[in-house]
C-alpha cells in the first residue's frame, strides 16, 4: 500500500492534545528581513537568533538588526539587542559559535566608514553576556577558532594581514602581510598563502605557502609557486605550478608541510580545478576536472599516504571550480557515498558506493513505485537523487539528502525513478539500510529533519503557499501523521532541529502573512509526549549492517568488517534519548579482492573485481615520486583500501623500492626550506 | 522616503475595465499589506480593497466583490487594482495605502481619478 | 457594516483654539480606530491609530481617546496647517468604514 494508507497507521494516539500542549509560538518585534540562527554548545539549548532588516533609501541602505536568545531549545526567546549596544550585525560574517562546549560567541558590527578598526562583541558565557571590543583591523573573514583551544583566534583583515588573537578577541595582533588564505591545522597550527607582488589575484600560482605553530613567533615556508591549499583528515594538500608551463599538480604531506611528495593524479590546466570531495584520517576522495568546460571528471581514491591514486569513477559531475558536485558522505553508514554522473546525453545519473569508493552502481529501484518518462524500458530503472546540482539548478528540491550518524541506516532524499534524473517535481524518497533499498517516503518535494536518532522524522510540504500543517512518523517514514500546528498559515522558510538529531524539538520558522505587515515567526514543536516512555531493550533488533545475502558467511563485510548493529523496531514508539549512544558489534572479515583497491597503473572494469593493467601503462616500469625520492612500484594490481580491516584469505603481492634517486616536483625540498622568527 | 505614486486612472465607459498601478517606494513593500480607498465627488471614503504582505490574502466591500481583484507584484514594489463591469458610482479619486504593524493607512498615496460616464 | 457617525460636518475655529471631532461607531469597536488628515487638493496622512497612539512625526497637540463605540480626536493650540479635512476609519471588523469627515476652517 502506498505510503501512510496502511492499517497499522493508527498507532500514535491523542497525539493532537500532546502536541499541542507542547507548541510554543513566538512571534518576533521584526519586520522581515532575514534571520540567521546558531545553536551554543551541546545540549545546551541555547540559541542564538539574529535578525537583520535592511531600509532601502534612496542613497543608502539603513541596517538594523535584533538578537535573540533562548536556552529553552527554541520555546521561548529574550531580546537581548541590548546587550550588544543596539549595535547592527553583518549578517554576512554570521555567528562565529565556538568549537565544542565553550559557550563563545562573536559577532561582528558593522562600524561607519572612516573608523580606523572594525568591531565585535565576545561572550564566553554562551551569549548571557557580551564584551564589546574595537578591533585594530577591519576584518575580511570571520573571526576562525582554533579548534584544539577556543581562546585563540585568527582573521583576515581587508588589508590581507593575518592577525590572530590568544585571549579570545581582546587583544589582537597582525603575525603577517600580504595573506590570501589562512586555516588553522592540528595542534594550533596556522597554514597560510602569502603573495610577494600585486595581490592575491595576480600571484595565483606563485604564492607562498607558511606555517606557524606557535601563533606567529616563527614561521617556516613550507611551498613555493603555489596556487591553492587544502587540510582534510591527516593530509595536507597543495596544488602547485609547474616550472615549464602553466598546468598545476597536487602534492601531499602528511608531517604539516615538512615533507612532501607529489600525489599521482593528473596536471589540471588554468580553467581546471581540483576538489577534495571528502577525507579522513585514513584516505581521501578527489575530484580531478576534465580539460574543457564539460561540467564533470573523475573521482580518485587516494592510498593511506595520500599519494597513489586510484581511479574510481568517471565523469563526475562537478560544474565549475567552486560550483557544484551532489558528492554526499552517508553519514548513517560506513563506506556510503552517493554522487551524479553525467552522461554521454547529457543526462545525469545517481550512483552510489557502499565500499568507499571501490565500486560505484545504481540506485535500486523503490519497490513502490513506477518508472517514470525518462526509462526506455518500464520494468528496469533506478533512483536518481537529487542534491546540490538540482537546488542549485533551481528544480523543485527544497533539500538536499539526509542521514545522521546516530539514526543508523536512514537515508532521506528527493528524487526520481527512471534512466536519468528528471526535472519534474520529486518525491521523498527514505532508505532504512544506509542506500541499498529505498521506498517512497512522501509525495512531490518536502522539508525533513531526524529526531531522536531517528525515532521521529518529521517533514513539511515545500509549497508556495502559507502553510499550516507539518508531518511525523515514528516509523522511519512508513506513516504519517499530520498536525495543524497553527491557525494561522505562515510562509514557511525553515525547519531547525538541534545538531545531531539527538533532540525531540523542532523549529518551524516563517513570517506572517498578514493584512498589516509580515513579521518573523517561530513555533516550536516538543515531541516528547509522543514517545512517552524511554526505549528498552525489547524496543531494540539486531541489524547486520551491508547484508546482501544472508547466506553467505562474509555477508555484511566492508572495509574488511561487519557491523551489527542494535536498532531500534520500527514499531516501537519509544524514546532513545539524548543519551542514546549506537550499540554495534564490529567482526574481522577474511581478506578478498573487494578489500583491495587497484593500485597505480591498474583499473577495474566494469562487473568485475579483478584489476588489470592500464593499456598505456603496459610493460613500463612504474615509478613515482616520494619525499623527493624516486620509487619503484612492484605490484600485482592491487593495495589494501585504506582503513580496511580483514586479515587472511586473499593476499596480493605490493612492494614499493627506493630507487635512491633524486625527484623533483616543482616543490621545496625539505633541505632548502627556510624558518624566520618573529 | 515612503513613497507611492498611483497611475492608470481614466474616463471609462460604464461596462469597461481598467487597471490601476501603485508604485511603491522607500520601504521593504513585501513585509506591508496595502490597500485601495476611493473618495468620491462628495468627498466621502470607501475602502475598496486589500491584500495581505505575500497576496495570499484579499478582502474587498461587498460593493466591489466579484467586479475588483487586487493583487501585488512584490519584486516589482507595484500594488495593482484590476476594475470591471464598472459604474458610474465607481467613480472616485483611487488612493493606495500601505499598512504598518498597528493598522492599515498609515501612508496614502497622491491618488488617480477614475470617471465612468457615457 | 459598522456606521461610523462623525460629527460635526464642519466647524470654524480661530488659531490657537482647542477643538474636539468625535466619532460614534454603531458597535463597539475596542479602539480599532484611526484618525485622517486630508489637507486642500493633497492626499491623507495617518495621524492617530488604535484611538490613542500618535503616528511618528505627527504633533503632540494631537490626541485622541475614547473606548467602546465613542471616540475623539482633540487639536490643541490649533496651527495654521492644521485647517484640513480630517476623517476616522475604524478596523475592527471587514469592511472597513469611515466617517462622514470635518471640515476645519480658519474663523
Known amino acids: 500500500s502506498a505510503p501512510g494508507e496502511d492499517e497499522e497507521c493508527g498507532r500514535v494516539r491523542d497525539f493532537v492534545a500532546k502536541l499541542a500542549n507542547n507548541t510554543h509560538q513566538h512571534v518576533f518585534d521584526d519586520l522581515r528581513g532575514s534571520v540567521s540562527l546558531s545553536w551554543v554548545g551541546d545540549s545546551t539549548g541555547v540559541i542564538l537568533v539574529l535578525t537583520t532588516f535592511h531600509v532601502p533609501l534612496v542613497i543608502m541602505t539603513f541596517g538594523q538588526s535584533k538578537l535573540y536568545r533562548s536556552e529553552d531549545y527554541g520555546k521561548n526567546f529574550k531580546d537581548i539587542t541590548d546587550l550588544i549596544n543596539n549595535t547592527f550585525i553583518r549578517t554576512e560574517f554570521g555567528m562565529a559559535i565556538g568549537p565544542e562546549n565553550s559557550g563563545k560567541v562573536v559577532l561582528t558590527a558593522e562600524v561607519s566608514g572612516g573608523s580606523r578598526g572594525g568591531r565585535i562583541f565576545r561572550s564566553s558565557d554562551f551569549a548571557k553576556n557580551f564584551v564589546q571590543t574595537d578591533l585594530p583591523f577591519h576584518p575580511l573573514t570571520q573571526m576562525m577558532y582554533s579548534p584544539q583551544n577556543s581562546d585563540y583566534l585568527l582573521a583576515l583583515s581587508t588589508e590581507n594581514g593575518l592577525w590572530v588573537s590568544k585571549n579570545f578577541g581582546g587583544k589582537w595582533e597582525e603575525i603577517h602581510k600580504a595573506v590570501c588564505l589562512a586555516k588553522w591545522g592540528s595542534d594550533n597550527t596556522i597554514f597560510f598563502t602569502t603573495y610577494a607582488n600585486g595581490s592575491c589575484k595576480a600571484d595565483l600560482g606563485a604564492l607562498e605557502l607558511w606555517r606557524t605553530s606557535d601563533l606567529g613567533k616563527s614561521f617556516k615556508t613550507i611551498g613555493v609557486k603555489i596556487y591553492s591549499f587544502g587540510l582534510g583528515g591527516r593530509f595536507l594538500f597543495a596544488s602547485v605550478m609547474a616550472d615549464k608551463d602553466t598546468t598545476r599538480r597536487i602534492h601531499v604531506s602528511t608531517d604539516q608541510g615538512d615533507t612532501w611528495s607529489m600525489a599521482q593524479l593528473p596536471s589540471v590546466g588554468q580553467e581546471q580545478f581540483y576538489s577534495i570531495l571528502a577525507a579522513n584520517d585514513d584516505m581521501v576522495f578527489m575530484h580531478v576536472d576534465e580539460p574543457g568546460d564539460t561540467g564533470f571528471g573523475t573521482i580518485f581514491t587516494s592510498d593511506d599516504r595520500g599519494i597513489v591514486y586510484s581511479k574510481s569513477l568517471d565523469r563526475h559531475l562537478y560544474t565549475t571550480t567552486g560550483g557544484e558536485t551532489d558528492f554526499t558522505n552517508v553519514t548513517s553508514l560506513r563506506g556510503v557515498y552517493i554522487t551524479s554522473v553525467l552522461s554521454e546525453d547529457n543526462s545525469i545519473q545517481t550512483m552510489i558506493t557502499f565500499d568507499q569508493g571501490g565500486r560505484w552502481t545504481h540506485l535500486r529501484k523503490p519497490e513502490n513505485s513506477e518508472c517514470d518518462a525518462t526509462a526506455k524500458n518500464k520494468n528496469e530503472c533506478s533512483l536518481h537523487i537529487h542534491a546540490s546540482y538540482s537546488i542549485s539548478q533551481k528544480l523543485n528540491v527544497p533539500m538536499a539528502p539526509l542521514s545522521e550518524p546516530n539514526a543508523v541506516g536512514i537515508v532521506i532524499a528527493h528524487g526520481s525513478v527512471g534512466d536519468a534524473i528528471s526535472v519534474m517535481v520529486p518525491d521523498v524518497y527514505i532508505s532504512d539500510d544506509g542506500g541499498y533499498s529505498w521506498t517512497k517516503m512522501l509525495e512531490g518535494p518536502h522539508y525533513y529533519t531526524i529526531l531522536d536518532s531517528g525515532g521521529i522524522i518529521v517533514a513539511i510540504e515545500h509549497s508556495s503557499r502559507p502553510i499550516n500543517v507539518i508531518k511525523f512518523s515514528t516509523d522511519e517514514g512508513q506513516c504519517w501523521q499530520t498536525y495543524t500546528f497553527t491557525r494561522d498559515p505562515i510562509y514557511f522558510t525553515g525547519l531547525a532541529s538541534e545538531p545531531g538529531a539527538r533532540s525531540m524539538n523542532i523549529s518551524i520558522w516563517g513570517f506572517t502573512e498578514s493584512f498589516l505587515t509580515s513579521q518573523w515567526v517561530s513555533y516550536t514543536i516538543d515531541f516528547k509526549d509522543i514517545l512517552e516512555r524511554n526505549c528498552e531493550e525489547k524496543d531494540y533488533t539486531i541489524w547486520l549492517a551491508h547484508s546482501t545475502d544472508p547466506e553467505d558467511y562474509e555477508d555484511g563485510c566492508i572495509l574488511g568488517y561487519k557491523e551489527q548493529f542494535l536498532r531500534l523496531r520500527k514499531s516501537s514508539v519509544c524514546q532513545n534519548g539524548r543519551d542514546y549512544v549506537v550499540t554495534k558489534q564490529p567482526s574481522i572479515c577474511l581478506c578478498s579482492l573487494e578489500d583491495f583497491l587497484c593500485d597505480f597503473g591498474y583499473y577495474r572494469p566494469e562487473n568485475d573485481s579483478k584489476c588489470v593493467e592500464q593499456p598505456e601503462l603496459k610493460g613500463h616500469d612504474l615509478e613515482f615520486c616520494l619525499y623527493g625520492r624516486e620509487e619503484h612500484l612492484t605490484t600485482n594490481g592491487y593495495r589494501k583500501i585504506p582503513g580496511d580491516k580483514c586479515q587472511g584469505g586473499v593476499n596480493p603481492v605490493r612492494e614499493v623500492k627506493d630507487l635512491k634517486k633524486k625527484c623533483t616536483s616543482n616543490f621545496l625540498s625539505p633541505e632548502k626550506q627556510n624558518s624566520k622568527s618573529n | 522616503e515612503v513613497q507611492l505614486v498611483e497611475s492608470g486612472g481614466d474616463l471609462v465607459k460604464p461596462g469597461g475595465s481598467l487597471k490601476l498601478s501603485c508604485a511603491a517606494s522607500g520601504f521593504t513593500f513585501n513585509t506591508h499589506g496595502m490597500s485601495w480607498v476611493r473618495q468620491t465627488p462628495d468627498k466621502s471614503l470607501e475602502w475598496v480593497a486589500t491584500?495581505?504582505?505575500?497576496?495570499?490574502?484579499?478582502s474587498y466591500p461587498d460593493s466591489v466583490k466579484g467586479r475588483f481583484t487586487i493583487s501585488r507584484d512584490n519584486a516589482k514594489n507595484t500594488l495593482f487594482l484590476q476594475m470591471s463591469s464598472l459604474k458610474s458610482e465607481d467613480t472616485a479619486m483611487y488612493y493606495c495605502?500601505?499598512?504598518?504593524?498597528?493598522?492599515?493607512?498609515?501612508?496614502w498615496g497622491t491618488g488617480t481619478t477614475v470617471t465612468v460616464s457615457s | 457594516d459598522i456606521l461610523m457617525t462623525q460629527s460635526p460636518s464642519s466647524m470654524s475655529v480661530s488659531l490657537g483654539d482647542t477643538v474636539s471631532i468625535t466619532c460614534h461607531a454603531s458597535q463597539g469597536i475596542s479602539s480599532n480606530i484611526g484618525w485622517l488628515q486630508q489637507k486642500p487638493g493633497k492626499s491623507f496622512k495617518g495621524l492617530i491609530y488604535?484611538?490613542?497612539n500618535l503616528e511618528d512625526g505627527v504633533p503632540s497637540r494631537f490626541s485622541g481617546s475614547g473606548s467602546g463605540a465613542d471616540y475623539s480626536l482633540t487639536i490643541s493650540s490649533l496651527e495654521y496647517e492644521d485647517f484640513a479635512d480630517y476623517y476616522c476609519?475604524?478596523?475592527?471588523?471587514?469592511?472597513?468604514?469611515f466617517g462622514g469627515g470635518t471640515k476645519l476652517e480658519i474663523k
Open positions: 491584500i495581505s504582505t505575500g497576496g495570499f490574502y484579499t
Open positions: 488604535h484611538g490613542t
Open positions: 476609519v475604524q478596523y475592527a471588523h471587514f469592511p472597513y468604514t
Open positions: 495605502a500601505k499598512s504598518s504593524s498597528h493598522w492599515y493607512f498609515d501612508v
